[in-house]
């Protein structure tokens, strides 16, 4: 006769592990008892259970509540064992000696792989901001057992780094991803994909990546001179620009307070019917917590009756 | 045959000391187990000491322990119970009895044992 | 320790009796379990073994079952060379156990 088992048999942390141990023997031959042990290199065997064809099963009281016959119905041949909810711990060397009848003593060796699923954590760089130069946008790191592998999946460019660090049972990776914030990387997701032959699928960690700019400030309302005439109703300015974080405005006049009437809605500046009052110098203040911008125009209100033609300058200022 | 011939018994002070032996013929007395039962008067059975088939490695009940020493001459085929600082509650009549090892510490019920030995501790 | 609790402590019975005497395990113990046979003055004579192996050259008029924390000893047809006390033993753990036992005399 000879013994059937695996070389090795792997299990997911917490999940139970059978041990295989079948007894293929001649017609007549019985099996009296089987002994599982651990073996690990250098230490003496530990008992693990017996298996007796007639005191049933022993469990040795280190693995009291964990060590079970798989379920009847049961070949007589059968010396496979259960192990419960398999720890890290458990990874090793086991041996299974069965002493059968008129054959004699036969044993076998396995390995038990205790694979340990990785828990992954990302965790964002410093904040980004336009402008600066390469700069870590998102760190990720997964401890598992054997080593987790850690990827990125993003439409954006960047480099990545990996370094590994060895724990006696385990291993944790961390992975960087490296970036040159622009603008047109605001919203982006980053993703962070990990993985492990003990999971079923990867784990995904999505970061939205926040990169602060403010754009060039810019008026408008002012593209069609003529319209801007004494008795003229509606007229109004806009200010125009972009940022992350959104930005607030300010409107002033550079040569005096703001004229009564005049209405300051966020970025809109709102004109009663126009007047020569309302000719001046208008400032359009733009910031977030990233930056600010002005942009200044010169409004110059027409009056009809007068051949001089209207003069308009636009001036940009940062 | 099977015999188990203990032997060492009999009347000593509290806080003496006294060895028991078993003698063993008929089997191959290395492989196996052996301990020691003891039986007060008038009462139930109490094991008291085990002994593997051929290491050292011994066994004690937590009312002997430090007190008495379970040993074999596997060469002799005999098997010795050396009881110290005896008390009043160790009289009982001591048997030997023999156990097949299946595995590990695991062993069969007692299958054969002795006829037993007296012992008494009485001032 | 593992206790083990026999019933009843006595019981009296005729010959051609059928006697049941119960053993209980404070814990699983698979089938490590031993039916003994004491008559006075006597060393104990194993009768069961494996909670329900007869042991060599012991009537069949004695059987033993059960497993796990249950066993029972049972004399089909008392004799009158059977009136003895018995006792349990668990061997799955050190120190094995006996049970108090169980004194069957005659009715």
């Known amino acids: 006769g000879e013994l059937e088992t695996s070389d090795v048999v792997t299990v997911v942390l917490g999940q139970d592990a059978k041990l295989p141990c079948f007894y293929r023997g001649d017609s007549g031959e019985q099996v009296g008892q089987v002994a599982w042990a651990r073996v690990d290199a250098g230490e003496g065997a530990q008992e693990l259970a017996l298996l007796h064809s007639k005191y049933g099963l022993h469990v040795s009281p280190a693995y009291e509540g964990r060590v079970e016959q798989p379920p009847p119905p049961r070949n007589p041949l059968d010396g496979s064992v259960l192990l419960r909810n398999a720890v890290q711990a458990d990874e090793g060397e086991y041996e299974c000696r069965v002493s059968t009848f008129p054959a004699g003593s036969f044993q076998a060796r396995l390995r038990l792989r205790v694979l340990v699923p990785p828990l992954p954590s990302l965790n964002p760089g410093p904040a980004l901001e336009e402008g600066q130069g390469l700069t870590l946008a998102a760190s990720c790191t997964a401890e598992g057992s054997p080593a987790p592998s850690v990827t990125w999946d993003t439409e954006v460019k960047g480099t990545t780094s990996s370094r590994s660090f060895k724990h006696s049972r385990s291993a944790a990776v961390t992975s960087e991803f490296h970036l040159v914030p622009s603008r047109s990387m605001n919203g982006q997701p980053l993703t962070c994909v990990v993985s492990h032959p003990g999971l079923l699928q990867d784990q995904r960690i999505t970061h939205i990546l926040h990169v602060s700019f403010l754009a060039e400030a810019s008026v408008r309302g002012l593209e069609d001179q003529n319209l801007w005439h004494i008795g003229r109703e509606g007229a109004m300015l806009k200010c125009l620009s972009e940022g992350q974080p959104p930005p607030s405005y300010n409107w002033t006049r550079l040569d005096g307070p703001l004229p009564s009437g005049v209405r300051v809605d966020g970025d809109t500046l709102g004109f009663p019917p126009l007047t020569t009052e309302h000719s001046g110098i208008y400032v359009c203040h733009v910031s977030n917590e990233f930056s600010s911008r002005d942009s200044q125009v010169t409004v110059d209100v027409l009056d009809p009756q007068e051949d001089s033609g209207k003069q308009v300058d636009l001036v940009s200022a940062s | 045959e099977v015999q188990l011939v203990e032997s060492g018994g009999g009347l000593v002070q509290p806080g003496g000391s006294l060895r028991l032996s078993c003698a063993a013929s008929g089997f191959s007395f290395g492989s196996y187990g052996m301990s020691w039962v003891r039986q007060a008067p008038g009462k139930g059975l109490e094991w008291v000491s085990g002994i593997k088939p051929s290491t050292s490695t011994t066994y004690y009940a937590d009312s002997v322990k430090g007190r008495f020493t379970i040993s074999r001459d596997n060469s002799k085929n005999t098997l010795y119970l050396q009881m110290n600082s005896l008390r009043a509650e160790d009289t009982a009549v001591y048997y030997c009895?023999?156990?097949?090892?299946?595995?590990?510490?695991?062993?069969?019920?007692?299958?054969?044992w002795g006829q037993g030995t007296l012992v008494t501790v009485s001032s | 320790d593992i206790q083990m609790t026999q019933s009843p402590s006595s019981l009296s019975a005729s010959v051609g009796d059928r006697v049941t005497i119960t053993c209980r395990a404070s814990q699983g113990i698979s089938s490590y379990l031993a039916w003994y046979q004491q008559k006075p003055g006597k060393a104990p004579k194993l009768l069961i073994y494996?909670?329900?192996s007869l042991q060599s050259g012991v009537p069949s008029r004695f059987s033993g079952s059960g497993s796990g924390t249950d066993f029972t000893l049972t004399i089909s047809s008392l004799q009158p060379e059977d009136f003895a006390t018995y006792y349990c033993q668990q061997h799955y753990t050190t120190p094995p156990t006996f049970g108090q036992g169980t004194k069957v005399e005659i009715k």
């Open positions: 494996a909670a329900s």
């Open positions: 009895a023999r156990a097949e090892l299946l595995a590990f510490d695991v062993y069969t019920a007692s299958d054969y």
